[in-house]
């Protein structure tokens, strides 16, 4: 014969516990069911009656099965420099999360306490360890043949871009200049041609501008694209 | 007509050295970046280094800074390319490169290359 | 791994036409940076086919030509010939890099 099924409330056998979803009441001394997320008990079981469960209120939740007799109170609203990432719902809690270009500089189980801005690496630094939800931005010098011209929680240093001819040796805050136009990125005709930053890899020396067989008056400015010809001199 | 002529490559032991010639002639030497490029046997093309047309500024891929030196001659119209430290991984065709007109971001000419083997 | 998407291998018989694509990300082309195309015949020098996206250099016919859009890049060529049969290799600049990447290579076979 098949075992009986036991309803709730019912004594365990000496030595067992309680199924899933069960607890034991010390009182009654007896198996109880619990209440289900967004539930608490309103009324503890006794040896012939189980828990009486009932919904949360209004701004307040349980996440888990549980047997409280009141529901947890939802955290207070998010400050004006966090984001509601979820809702408080009778079955979670509120969770607030710094908004972009900030990290939480104090954290509490259900969230955060204190955002703070996030480190901005000024001209001549890049970001080394990018920030996160809860960690600052690290910022590096840029390294010989690399620059950074921005002030960015962002940006890396990149390399110095390559010239055919370098007109102003880049520095850590500044991309080499060309002489003769490199222009790398398409541009629309007739627009002024900035250098382009790349990133990190490269290794350069620069020591001073280079002498230029390329005439001064291409400078900076964007060519047509002209094909390999025989015997063809520089820009 | 453009002519890029590499020389220099040959076989060398793990650790050793090895000094790659570009002899280029045919246009203005010295007012383009120029380039060496390599390709291991069966793979694809990898950028090794580059140097400006006036060599106050050189520029090195990850894999062999520190290791590899770029260096031009602009009276003699040559391209260097000392490799010290060589690994097994190194060994390949290294092309030297012309840097375009305008953008030495691609290259418009190329030399016949020469194979640098590195085994012991 | 290249920084360059390519397809290892695309094949056609005479005549056909032919597209090799070249995929990268923002850092590349997806940044605006130009594209360039190479060939590389049977144990030659690699030989510069298309630069600046779509331009040809001297010499190069009107049978090949290039594109660009968005993040990727391709290489059309028309009335494919036997002479054509090489690998083929897009790059362009990177904002990760300080030299310019390659892609992976295409060998393109010409059947027949």
């Known amino acids: 014969l098949p075992a009986q099924v036991a309803f709730t409330p019912y004594a365990p056998e000496p030595g067992s516990t309680c199924r899933l979803r069960e607890y034991y009441d010390q009182t009654a001394q007896m198996c109880c069911s619990k209440c289900s997320p967004g539930q608490h008990a309103k009324v503890f079981c006794t040896k012939t009656s189980d828990t009486v469960c009932d919904s949360c209120e209004d701004s307040t939740y349980t996440q888990l099965w549980n047997w409280v007799p009141e529901c947890l109170s939802c955290g207070s609203r998010c400050s004006s420099d966090q984001v509601e990432t979820q809702a408080c719902t009778r079955e979670q809690n509120r969770i607030c999360a710094c908004e972009a270009g900030r990290y939480c500089a104090l954290k509490t189980h259900s969230g955060c306490r204190l955002c703070a801005p996030l480190r901005k690496c000024r001209p001549g630094f890049g970001v080394a360890r990018p920030g996160t939800e809860t960690s600052d931005v690290v910022c590096k010098p840029c390294a010989p043949g690399t620059f950074s011209n921005t002030t960015s929680s962002t940006d890396i240093c990149r390399p110095h871009q390559i010239c055919n001819v370098v007109a102003i040796p880049g520095n850590a805050s500044m991309d080499a200049v060309c002489t003769s136009t490199s222009p790398t990125r398409s541009m629309a005709p007739g627009a002024v041609h900035l250098p382009q930053p790349v990133s990190t890899r490269s290794q350069h020396t620069q020591p001073t501008p280079e002498p230029s067989t390329a005439p001064s008056t291409s400078f900076l400015l964007p060519m047509g694209p002209s094909p390999p010809a025989e015997g063809s001199t520089g820009d | 007509e453009v002519q890029l002529l590499e020389s220099g490559g040959g076989l060398v032991q793990p650790g050793g050295s090895l000094r790659l010639s570009c002899a280029a002639s045919?246009?203005?030497?010295?007012?383009?970046?120029m380039h060496w490029v390599r390709q291991a046997p069966g793979k694809g093309l990898e950028w090794v280094s580059a140097?400006?047309?006036?060599?106050?500024?050189?520029y090195y891929a990850d894999s062999v800074k520190g290791r590899f030196t770029i260096s031009r001659d602009n009276s003699k119209n040559t391209l260097y390319l000392q490799m010290n430290s060589l690994r097994a991984e190194d060994t390949a065709v290294y092309y030297c490169?012309?840097?375009?007109?305008?953008?030495?971001?691609?290259?418009?000419?190329w030399g016949q290359g020469t194979l640098v083997t590195v085994s012991s | 791994q290249s920084v360059l998407t390519q397809p290892p291998s695309a094949s056609g018989t005479p005549g056909q036409r032919v597209t090799i694509s070249c995929t990268g990300s923002?850092?590349?082309?997806?940044?605006?940076?130009?594209v360039h195309w190479y060939q590389q015949l049977p144990g030659t020098a690699p030989k510069l086919l298309i630069y600046?996206?779509?331009q040809r250099p001297s010499g190069v016919p009107d049978r090949f030509s290039g594109s660009k859009s968005g993040t990727s890049a391709s290489l059309a060529i028309s009335g494919l010939r036997s002479e054509d049969e090489a690998d083929y290799y897009c790059?362009?600049?990177?904002?990760?890099?300080?030299?310019?990447?390659f892609g992976g290579g295409t060998k393109l076979t010409v059947l027949g």
């Open positions: 490169a012309k840097g375009g007109t305008g953008d030495p971001y691609y290259f418009d000419y």
């Open positions: 045919g246009f203005t030497f010295s007012s383009y970046a």
């Open positions: 600046r996206n779509n």
């Open positions: 923002s850092s590349n082309i997806g940044a605006g940076y130009d």
């Open positions: 790059a362009a600049r990177d904002d990760g890099l300080s030299g310019p990447v």
């Open positions: 140097i400006s047309g006036g060599a106050t500024t050189t």
